[in-house]
Structure formats: structure tokens, C-alpha cells
Amino acid sequence: PLATIPVSTTSLTSSEGSTISTPSVDISTPVTTSIVGDQCSRCKNGGFWDGLKCQCLTPYYGESCEEVVNSIDIAPPETVSAQMELTVTVTSVKFTDELKNHSSQEFREFNKTFTEQMNIVYSGIPEYVGVNITNLRLGSVVVEHDVLLRTKYTPEYKTALDNATEVVKQKITKVTTEQIMTNDNCSALMCFNTTGTQVQNITVTQYDPVEECRQKAEEYEDYFLVEYRDQKPYCISPCESGFNASKNCNHGKCQMSQNGARCLCVTTETHWYSGEDCNQGTQKSHHHHHH
């Protein structure tokens, strides 16, 4: 048999008019019950019994996982990155078969010079991390390589990385146009064939806090939304206070249902409250008060 827990009750009336009695104890306070039989059925919404309590799945909480949280943790990555696949043609080095072997002295030296050259080319780009040669082939030396970009996550990270990729394109085009062979000789660190410069592909980290929020909110996805504070995204329901989208329930408690957030209005000893936002107070008559 279930143990009886003495708690005072407060009568709550939903905005639709039904009166609900709820315990006035904090829902997060553990309530000890002595339960006989299968515990699994006690945990709702996919929660499971760990021997002591219900372990709830997002977005649920509560003794039986019956309540919906007001906010869901979403963790954007600290940094976001972009990878640009580029090809340039170096004319100041003649291709030899040893360049195909990434552990050869030839490759290591070429890699060192090429990296130095690209570090100079991209030195003014704060997002620039480095280059990675993926393949060298004949012609003089066709260099297939990745340019790596990284920036701190902000809501505008895509714009920042898109801008950086544009600057990379401008800078590589400029250097491969200016640093060219003269009389079969190169006076620069490396010389290039202007027509051999190509951007093959650009891959940008995909992180969408709205999508993560919706996924974690599951069947409540239409009612959870993302708001930012100090450039950090928060996945909240209207029942979470302190945000632009927060629902003000005045004399009531905000509760999530599958139809969205609703206010459960309080009935006190002196007043009952109604209305969508529990802002309409009606004083109880004297005799009703003493009944």
C-alpha cells in the first residue's frame, strides 16, 4: 500500500476553469513512499526506476517523470570551424616521385616551405589555424590542401566563417597572381601558376541551437524556443521566468501541457483567480470565507 504523506493542499484552477488540488510542497522535494510491486509502471514518459527513484528522460522531471522542465540544457561547441579544400600550382618546385611519400625528406621540406608561405599569406585572418597538404601531384607541383579556420561559437558564427573563407579566397588569388616565375626563376618564397588556383569545397561546422532545442523537447518542440543571453543560447519553455518569451502567470503556476504553456490559477482563502494569465482576482464573500 502507498504511504500517506501529510501535506497541505492549495487549490489551483486552470484557465479552462477546472479546479486541481496540488501539493504545496516543492515538487523537487523527494517524497518517500513505500511501494510494493513493479516500480517500472511508476515512472512515466519513458523514465526508468533505478532502485531508488525515477530516472527521467529529457524534457521530463518529477517523482514519476510527469512534469515538463522549464528549460533544457543545450551545449553549443566552444569553437566552430570551417575547412576549405583548395588547389594551387607551385611552379618554383619541380615534381619528383618522392613528394608522394609523406614521410620522405622531400615532402617534409616542401610541407615546411608551403606551410611557411601560407602562414604569411593568411597572417591577417584571425580565424586561420593552418594548412594541411592532402596530396601532391605532377604539374609542376599541384598542391591539394585544406585551409583550416576556427572561431569561438557565437550566434553569428556562420557569418564570421563565411567572411573568413571569402578573405582566404581573396588572399590566395592575390598571392598566386603576384608571386610568379620571371625568366624561369622565383624571387619569392614560392611561385605559383595563376590559373591553377581553385577552391574545391568548403565545409562549415553545422550547429543549430534551435534544432537541438526542438529535438530535446520532443513532443513539446513547438512550445520550446531559443533565447540568447550573453551570446549563449538557452532552450526554454514559456514557463521559464526571466526571458522575453516568459509567460507571466501572476497569481498562478505555469505548467506545460501538450497544448503549450498554461496558467494554473491559485485559489487562496480570500480570493480566487481566473483568466488566461490568472490576473483576474475575485474576492470571496465573507460567508464563503468562513464556511
Epitope: 619541380k94 618522392e98 622531400e106 616565375m181 619569392a188
Partner: nanobody
């Protein structure tokens, strides 16, 4: 570690000749490139001549027709034959080597260096 040792410098009169040598510790660069650079006091190091394993040679405009670069792979030695020397040729001469078949007279493109040998040309 690859060692390069330059020698053969000295003092000559304008119009005179010198032959510089650069001995490599092994034949590592026989499939790459070797070069001569020079640096006059207060000036940047500049490329003088290159020779590559494919037989290609390249020269700075200022020495074309007067200097000849060559190498003896059997002896692992690089040479620079200098004739018609001018006071402007006065500098410290360095040999450099690369595993790459290079076409670059920019010193930053070269990773292995010998210590210098001084050439002084007086008028």
C-alpha cells in the same frame, strides 16, 4: 644531420677570378638542388646561382655570364667559378641545399646552409 662546408674565398683585384667549393657531408642533395647566396655588409642575403639534379641552372642577373655553378656528385661538392670579379661582388658567400628540385633564389626557400666564405674584391 647534413653538414655543408664552404671554402675558397679570398681577396682579389677587380677583374680577377676565384673558385668557391662547398662540400656536403653526403650525397643527400644529388636528387635535389644546391645554390650559392651572398650577403654584403648591411644588405640582405641574395641568391647568386642554383643547380638542380635535373641539370637546370639559374643565375641572378648581376652575375650572368661571369659566374658558373657546377657540382661533382662523386665528391659531393658544389662549385662556383667566378671570373671578371667586381668590387660589387664583395660579400660573404654561403652555399645552401634543398631536397627539392627548386627554382627559387629566395633564401627563405632553402633549409640547409653552410657557414660563409669571405670574398673581397678591391679596385
Amino acid at each position: 644531420d647534413v653538414q655543408l662546408q664552404a671554402s675558397g674565398g679570398g681577396s682579389v683585384q677587380a677583374g680577377g677570378s676565384l673558385r668557391l667549393s662547398c662540400a656536403a657531408s653526403d650525397n643527400t642533395f644529388s636528387r635535389g638542388s644546391m645554390s650559392w647566396f651572398r650577403q654584403a655588409p648591411g644588405k640582405e642575403r641574395e641568391g647568386v646561382a642554383i643547380i638542380s639534379s635535373d641539370g637546370w641552372t639559374g643565375y641572378a642577373d648581376s652575375v650572368k655570364g661571369r659566374f658558373t655553378i657546377s657540382q661533382d656528385n662523386a665528391k659531393n661538392t658544389l662549385y662556383l667559378q667566378m671570373i671578371g670579379l667586381k668590387p660589387d661582388d664583395t660579400a660573404m658567400y654561403y652555399c645552401a641545399a634543398s631536397f627539392l628540385v627548386l627554382r627559387a633564389l629566395n633564401p627563405k626557400a632553402w633549409h640547409y646552409w653552410g657557414q660563409g666564405t669571405q670574398v673581397t674584391v678591391s679596385s
